[in-house]
């Protein structure tokens, strides 16, 4: 028997530095987790202790913090090279800056293979990108060889910006011939490494003949056997065992996200490459694991440029930007108005004389606004200030919803009003009146929305059967804060730009801002 240790990460999303337990900015270092310096310590410890070790990443290193905003992927290549990753699969976010934003900083600089079997280049791009990413790679490990075959969500064109010269094929259809090719090369130990989500990972394990292990990403799935060490609730045991159509037991793993855990899977193969046993668990990278000093020093060196960037003035505010939970979770707050105005401004597209714009409405969960900005600092607004307001690295997306769904969302907004819960909605292009004396589910007494098909924008009553375009955080589009009705009832969903980028661009454009509380959200007399 031959034993292989698979170490794996996925959906790291630019968390190069250690983070707090919820993967936002590290505040109290003694309680912080993850980061590449700490990851390297653990990886090196395992490499020294065990003979056959692979370090794999299942995609979405790109996007999520100021590191990516400033370094645009160069940081990913540099630190993954430093950690000596053995292979990476392309995730959807690797295309966020277009194909050029993948080729130049990452594909050309990575010293490890970057994989995807179901992405096919065409046209002029085919020769430009040839050899920079591969469908599979055969890696020598000890005295054996292991085949790694990559895959990427076929929905990437709707989630990112891969352009028109890349075709994203069905994962299973594309993987099978590549695995068959590996078999003809006498490679009998094959790992599918990819970024399509846990459901697809399980399907690949079931349907693709010859795949021995699936290492996935995209769905931020946390698997664990036993008592979990932090706040994440396991979606199943680690590894999750799938019985393939040809009767094999195929382990499927994923390691949550944000570099908080290092996936650790031990596989025992027989001499014919069949999996005899598999066991392991994600390792929580908490402060009991020291940060590697040399990697940490390198991080600090790269950090200097970020500090300069994050303290530059984007624009000025001449009013207090009230992003306090005491305001934004209870009533209209001017920080909510500012963010919503930025979201609409980011989606201006006046190309048709019948419409002043294609979208006029914004909703934003009050709980997503994490900090105020005080104007008494010379009015200066920096990236750092905005990162405190919007620390989660989400996107502002465009959805199409029926009026009836919007009405449900606004009822949900105040269904348990008064408990300082995050679902209270801040708005733009919407006038809502609540009567809190009425029972939950029946508290919206007026809901007017700004017309789009008009030369002079004005507010009209919401029509239950009409379909409206709305800008909102991806958190809400995915049903967060209990807004399941949005996820369940949306009729279109377009991924948008990074939240901080949207607001910073708006502030830079406006130069001086002074958002007011102006009656977008009202409470009918006697109830508030």
């Amino acid at each position: 028997a031959w034993e292989l240790t698979i170490l794996h990460t996925n959906d790291v999303h630019s968390r190069l530095e250690q983070t707090s337990e919820d993967s936002s900015k590290c505040v109290n270092a003694s309680r912080c987790m993850g980061g590449v310096a700490r990851l390297f310590t653990k990886v090196q410890q395992i490499r020294r202790a065990e003979p056959n070790v692979l370090l794999l990443d299942a995609g979405d290193q790109y996007q999520g913090t100021i590191w990516f905003t400033v370094y645009k992927g160069a940081e990913v290549a540099h630190f993954m090279n430093a950690l000596r990753y053995d292979a990476m699969a392309l995730g959807n976010h690797e295309f966020d800056n277009g194909v050029e934003g993948l080729i130049e900083p990452l594909l050309k600089e990575a010293k490890f293979p970057i994989l995807s079997a179901n992405i096919k280049a065409k046209g002029p791009l085919a020769s430009q990108i040839s050899g920079l990413y591969l469908p599979y790679k055969v890696l020598p490990v000890g005295d054996e060889v292991v085949g790694i075959v990559g895959y990427t969500s076929k929905e990437t064109p709707f989630l990112s910006n891969p352009g028109t010269n890349l075709v994203f094929e069905d994962e299973i259809t594309a993987l099978q011939p590549e695995v068959d090719k590996l078999k003809t090369l006498n490679v009998n130990k094959i790992i599918a490494l990819g970024h399509s989500g846990f459901e697809m990972d399980k399907l690949i394990a079931q349907k693709v003949r010859g795949v021995d292990v699936v290492v996935g990403g995209h769905s931020n799935t946390f698997l664990y056997t036993g008592n979990p060490p932090s706040k994440e609730v396991p979606a199943g045991k680690y590894p999750f065992i799938v019985t393939s159509d040809d009767g094999r037991k195929v382990p499927v793993v994923q390691a949550y996200a944000f570099g908080k855990y290092l996936g650790y899977l031990k596989i025992e193969f027989d001499e014919r490459g069949n999996v005899i046993s598999s066991h392991g668990n994600p390792i929580l990278l908490n402060s009991s694991i020291p940060e590697d000093p040399s990697i940490k020093a390198d991080i600090n060196k790269w950090r200097i440029k970020l500090d300069n960037y994050s303290t530059q003035e984007l624009g000025k505010t001449i009013v207090y930007l009230d992003g306090s939970s005491q305001s934004c979770r209870f009533r209209e707050c001017n920080m909510g108005n500012l963010i919503c105005d930025a979201m609409i401004n980011n989606n201006l597209r006046h190309t048709d004389e019948m419409f002043w714009n294609h979208v006029s409405m914004c909703i934003l969960n009050g709980g997503g606004i994490r900090s105020p900005i005080d104007e008494r600092n010379n009015g200066t607004i920096t990236w750092e200030n905005l990162a405190a307001v919007l620390p989660f690295g989400g996107t502002f997306d465009l959805v199409q919803l029926k009026g009836s769904t919007l009405k449900k969302a606004f009822e949900h907004s105040v269904h348990r009003y008064g408990q300082s819960t995050g679902e209270f909605l801040q708005v733009g292009g919407i006038h809502v009146v609540y009567d809190l004396s009425r029972k939950p589910g029946d508290r919206v007494v007026k809901l007017d929305v700004l017309c789009t098909k008009c030369r002079v924008p004005s507010y009209d009553p919401l029509k239950m059967d009409e379909v409206y375009k709305v800008i909102l955080p991806n958190f809400l589009a995915n049903g967060g804060d209990g807004f399941q009705m949005i996820k369940d009832e949306l009729l279109r969903h377009d991924s948008g730009d990074q939240d901080i980028n949207v607001v910073s661009t708006y502030i830079s454009k406006m130069k001086v801002i002074y958002p007011a509380v102006e009656g977008r959200i009202k409470f009918s007399t006697g109830s508030h």
């Epitope: 929905e155 028109t164 369940d488 009832e489 377009d494």
Partner: antibody, heavy 119, light 107 residues
Amino acid sequence: EVQLLESGGGLVQPGGSLRLSCAASGFTFSNYIMGWVRQAPGKGLEWVSSISSSGGATIYADSVKGRFTISRDNSKNTLYLQMNSLRAEDMAVYYCAKDHLGGHGMDVWGQGTTVTVSS
Amino acid sequence: DIQMTQSPSSLSASVGDRVTITCRASQDISNYLAWFQQKPGKAPKSLIFAASSLESGVPSKFSGSGSGTDFTLTISSLQPEDSATYYCQQYNSYPLTFGGGTKVEIK
């Protein structure tokens, strides 16, 4: 392999009813917006109705509003179209279609089922 | 409702010819346009989405372009198996609407 298989078509008198079904396989049905498109003999394609991933939101072409009802059973991976008060102009081949994730156009179509409305 | 106007309604071309079909929307639809191919007695098949992105498994002789109101589908080198009716469809807003179709025949 992603597949959609319609059934339930047939001959019905004007004013009658029919229920079409579409059995889906090869993808996570509950993640996708689904719809019906029809094609009258010798004519082009006409969108009929769409339904959100959970079935909570439905939308119809004006020509069928109030007469047709789209629904889905995610536990059975099946899409339905209940057609009432059928008219001669409803006679067509009815196709079930799966949308790209997020409702970005239809990427997979069924083979179609024929509805004939005649007295 | 958004009207989609396709032209020509039919065309005849020789094997190897470059064929272009146009589609015009009555209002701006950004790039929310799809192209479908339908052969007699068969279901439509998706060729292009987002105006210019090729569906998985579709040969690269098919290409789409355009944004806003004017769009084109190009077949770079016509082959006998391309004889079919081609439809454009907007999915910018509901109701979803199709063009009237372009019938492509081989000379």
